[in-house]
């Protein structure tokens, strides 16, 4: 690596996936092994996130970006940057400090992931129940009782929400 | 660089706002941005982090759980401590620190500034 | 919640002579545990990442060893330059009401 003569800061010129290297009179050295640095001019390099056990890599760290983590099948990313994964459960189903337990009556979970939640009540928007609500699937409303007058047209269920990027189970 | 600031004597139950600016690199490249402290002649301390990411997550040390609050403005580039209920045990300097590990590893720090807290 | 013990507290010792400084956490923490030189009135630097590797601009005579619950940091020939207090740091994200993360108290390298 060639030094820098920069007339400003010797350092500005050093490349990303290099820093400038104090201890070798302001020399850009390559980033040492497992670390990196995205930008150039940088005095350090920063250390690269190690994807390891539970966790797998999606992206391998490089000289110039870290890399970046999931999680292994059965679990799924939880806080910044997947810091964590949790395990999954099965639909109907929430993760408590001793495991994976079946929804309460009148809960339910649509998601591997996530709590239990109450069913709707229909009867708040003054509407009928008209597919009641299972441990994996909420209740589905329908119109009120004094809606229903012959001729009515039927109700099609709508199809369970999903979170975004999440593919169907 | 990261460079503190906010520092000073304040009375015991008072309330102190430390800033950390950054340059040289982005907040939003996604670091944990975190708080160090040293009490005179003792050792270092964590005591916050945040995560520069969208989600912002924070984490706290026991002792500063309830009184101490970390945030981050990313079109400022600059982390925030805000200190309530200040006792003499938080007379420290105060450090930030940046790691890009996810596992506690600072490899930039700041200078650091001196709280006092004495009546 | 993590702790990290370190040991010797203070530890005398000669130009040229070979240094160990042991650190031990109270729990499993893999490998992810850094070391930092510090001297008075200054900032800590970072010597090693993930117990083995050398972080940047860091001279090759520093070196660092261990998994799980032990770990040692070794300077192999002590410089004038590395008299000065050396701390371990363990720990890892888990979530914001149990999180893990702790200094080991310091050992000071002084001149004998």
């Known amino acids: 690596f060639e030094r820098t003569r920069s007339l400003q800061d010797p350092c500005s010129n050093c490349p990303a996936g290099t820093f400038c290297d104090n201890n070798r009179n302001q020399i850009c050295s390559p980033c040492p092994p497992n670390s990196f640095s995205s930008a150039g001019g940088q005095r350090t390099c920063d250390i690269c996130r190690q994807c390891k056990g539970v966790f797998r890599t999606r992206k391998e760290c490089s000289s110039t970006s870290n890399a970046e983590c999931d999680c292994t099948p059965g679990f799924h990313c939880l806080g910044a940057g997947c810091s964590m994964c949790e395990q999954d459960c099965k639909q109907g189903q929430e993760l408590t400090k001793k495991g994976c337990k079946d929804c309460c009556f009148g809960t339910f979970n649509d998601q591997k992931r996530g709590i239990c939640r109450p069913w709707t009540n229909c009867s708040l928007d003054g509407k009928s129940v008209l597919v009641n609500g299972t441990k994996e699937r909420d209740v589905v409303c329908g119109p009120s009782p004094a809606d229903l007058s012959p001729g009515a047209s039927s109700v099609t269920p709508p199809a369970p929400a999903r979170e975004p990027g999440h593919s169907p189970q | 660089s990261l460079v503190e600031s906010g520092g000073g004597l304040v009375q015991p139950g008072g309330s102190l706002r430390l800033s950390c600016a950054a340059s040289?690199?982005?907040?939003?490249?996604?670091?944990?941005m975190c708080w160090v402290r040293q009490a005179p002649g003792k050792g270092l301390e964590w005591i916050a982090c945040i995560y520069t990411g969208s989600s912002g997550s924070t984490y706290y040390a026991n002792s500063a759980k309830g009184r101490f609050t970390i945030s981050r403005d990313n079109s400022k580039n600059t982390l925030y401590l805000q200190m309530n209920s200040l006792r003499a045990e938080d007379t420290a300097v105060y450090y930030c620190?940046?790691?890009?590990?996810?596992?506690?590893?600072?490899?930039?720090w700041g200078q650091g500034t001196l709280v006092t807290v004495s009546s | 919640a993590l702790v990290m013990t370190q040991s010797p507290s203070t530890l005398s010792a000669s130009v040229g002579d070979r240094v160990t400084i042991n650190c031990q956490a109270s729990?499993?923490?893999?490998?992810?545990l850094a070391w930092y030189q510090q001297k008075p009135g200054k900032a800590p630097k970072l010597l090693i990442f993930y117990a083995s590797d050398l972080a940047s601009g860091v001279p090759s005579r520093f070196s660092g060893s261990g998994s799980g619950t032990e770990f040692t940091l070794t300077i192999s020939s002590l410089q004038p330059d590395d008299f000065a207090t050396y701390y371990c740091?363990?720990?890892?994200?888990?979530?914001?009401?149990?999180?893990?993360?702790?200094f080991g108290g310091g050992t000071k390298v002084e001149i004998k």
């Open positions: 040289g690199f982005s907040f939003t490249s996604s670091y944990y």
């Open positions: 729990e499993d923490i893999d490998n992810y």
């Open positions: 620190a940046r790691d890009s590990s996810s596992y506690y590893m600072f490899n930039l």
């Open positions: 740091q363990g720990g890892y994200y888990t979530s914001s009401t149990d999180t893990r993360g702790a």
